[in-house]
């Protein structure tokens, strides 16, 4: 029997845990090992998350939202680990969790503040609307509200339209920029301050190329070293714009080092690819090949867009036949 004198009250301390939507997290709690361990995890001081005592879980009064989503590190309880393993966190799980741990001779209470972030990989799109050209930075699902900044030729732009739609658990955001008639380079940065995650989209317009029918054209596409890390998975897509929509010519996946080519006249240099140069060749040009060609290099952290405008003109032979 443990008399009163053994009682130790350890005041509440607070920790912050940041989780990502739909991922698993651990809410930490530790105590000085002792006999007769009782562990109660509660949410916002009201909802029962997890209870353990007399050597086993007791989840009869667990709030239904936590069913099959919580567990303890059972082999480590005797070593003073009362941490909670929490599966598939949602934004509704955000808030304060309290852990009560009692033993025969002491008690501690820990507070853990859970914050949940969302950052589905953003995209940078190039769109033509009638006679206007737009760059659009968008993120389908993000939380909390991100910081979006635009730069033109490395100079911040103050105008920053943001189209925002909020769902129950996150924001969907579009930030369009009218770049009609501009030859500048543009950069869009989306930052999730909670997850400390930043994504950058960069758009570069190359000088127009004039080619004759039946010739071939080389279009450069080399990533900017500031963003590009060859160790990170990325995808390269070459596409051509026709009547306002892009059709994919070829793409390359760094994870499998696979190249898929949809246009027989398109060629990639394997050696150059190994040196992170994704320039391409298009052989035997015809008049319908005139248009805009887009190289898109994308990873979780960036999108690099390079636009080439190609004008294919009739050759002398063809012209004289007409």
């Amino acid at each position: 029997i443990f008399p009163l004198a053994f009682f130790i009250y350890v005041p509440m301390n607070e920790q912050i845990v940041i989780g990502r939507l739909d991922e698993d997290i651990i809410l930490p709690s530790s105590f000085e090992r002792g006999s007769e361990v009782v562990i109660h995890w509660k949410y916002q001081d009201s909802y029962k998350v997890h209870s353990y005592y007399k050597g086993s879980d007791h989840l009869e009064s667990q709030d239904p939202r936590y069913a099959n989503r919580t567990s303890l590190f059972y082999n480590e309880i005797q070593n003073g680990n009362a941490s909670l393993f929490f599966r598939r966190v949602s934004l509704l799980d955000e808030g304060i969790y309290t852990c009560y741990v009692g033993t025969a001779i002491q008690v501690i209470t820990n507070k853990v503040v859970l914050k949940v972030g969302v950052f589905l990989t953003p995209v940078m799109k190039y769109e033509k609307r009638n006679t206007n050209s737009f760059l659009i930075c968008s993120v389908l699902s993000v939380y909390p509200r991100p910081i979006i900044t635009w730069k033109m030729d490395n100079t911040p732009i103050s105008e920053n339209n943001m189209e925002e739609t909020g769902s129950l658990d996150s924001f969907s955001i579009n930030s369009p920029l009218n770049i009609t008639g501009s030859n500048s380079s543009y950069e869009c940065t989306i930052e999730n301050s909670l997850l400390k995650q930043t994504w950058t989209g960069r758009w570069t317009m190359k000088d127009g190329l004039h080619k004759m029918q039946s010739e071939h054209v080389s279009l450069s596409c080399q990533p900017v070293n500031d963003y590009f890390s060859p160790n990170q998975d990325f995808k390269v897509t070459w596409s051509r714009m026709k009547s306002g929509t892009f059709s994919v010519l070829a793409y390359y996946l760094s994870s499998s080092q696979n190249t898929i080519i949809n246009e027989s006249r398109f060629s990639w240099n394997k050696e150059l690819i190994n040196q992170s140069d994704f320039s391409m060749n298009l052989m035997d040009l015809n008049l319908s090949d005139s248009g805009e060609y887009l190289c898109n290099i994308s990873s979780d952290e960036y999108t690099l867009l390079t636009i080439h405008t190609v004008h294919v003109e009739p050759s002398q032979e063809t012209a004289s036949h007409n």
Partner: antibody, heavy 123, light 108 residues
């Protein structure tokens, strides 16, 4: 019905002994710490003693330490308070109370009370 | 030793009025403080625990606030059945469970 019923109170002379009992029903008795609280006539509440579900943690107020003994019988859903060497200042209504934290002893509140039993110590 | 001091000792109010009861601890008890209501000839009843959480079945007119050493029980609009004695209790110090001296809320 969830309830606590105290018994065993009465008139007793100073220096004598008395044993109080508390019968619990309507809840899982062996999942809860149990407590004795007393209230002298016209006075406030005074915590007397507490016992964990397993009887491994026991606590007493300084005013009764060495004279009173708390115990429980989980098989009988019963709590006891053995009071020895009674004094006039022990005169009070004695309440049995249930601890609020399942299986927890420390930091628990008293979320269920009995109606009390009166102990009068007088010659 | 932690001592809880309740004030005022008596509060004379009319039904419908707001009641504000104070409980001061001689040293910090964090948020480990409860409020109980006791009517004549009855056992106490838990109203508020952990300083601000209402116990099961307690009406919303009862609310608790405070942490550390200063705590308040507020009854937003007194009902006839609310006239009683109210006790605060700390559960985190030495002695482990201590009650304040009580505040009597009586009809004016």
């Amino acid at each position: 019905e969830v309830q606590l019923v105290e018994s065993g109170g009465g008139l007793v002379q100073p220096g004598r002994s008395l044993r109080l009992s508390c019968a619990a029903s309507g809840f899982t008795f062996d999942d809860h710490a149990m407590f004795w609280v007393r209230q002298a006539p016209g006075k406030g509440l005074e915590w007397v003693s507490g016992i964990s579900w397993s009887s491994n943690s026991i606590a007493y107020a300084d005013s009764v330490k060495g004279r009173f003994t708390i115990s429980r019988d989980n098989a009988k859903n019963s709590l006891y308070l053995q009071m020895n060497s009674l004094r006039a200042e022990d005169t009070a209504v004695y309440y049995c109370a249930k601890g609020s934290i399942v299986a927890g002893f420390w930091l628990g509140y008293f979320d269920l009370w009995g109606r009390g039993t009166l102990v009068t110590v007088s010659s | 030793e932690i001592v809880l001091t309740q004030s005022p000792a008596t509060l004379s109010l009319s039904p419908g009025e707001r009641a504000t009861l104070s409980c001061r601890a001689s040293q910090s008890v964090s948020s480990y403080l409860a409020w109980y209501q006791q009517k004549p000839g009855q056992a106490p009843r838990l109203l508020i625990y952990d300083a601000s959480n209402r116990a099961t079945g307690i009406p919303a007119r009862f609310s608790g606030s405070g942490s550390g050493t200063d705590f308040t029980l507020t009854i937003s609009s007194l009902e006839p059945e609310d006239f009683a004695v109210y006790y605060c209790q700390q559960v985190s110090g030495n002695p482990l469970w201590t009650f304040g001296g009580g505040t009597k809320v009586e009809i004016k």
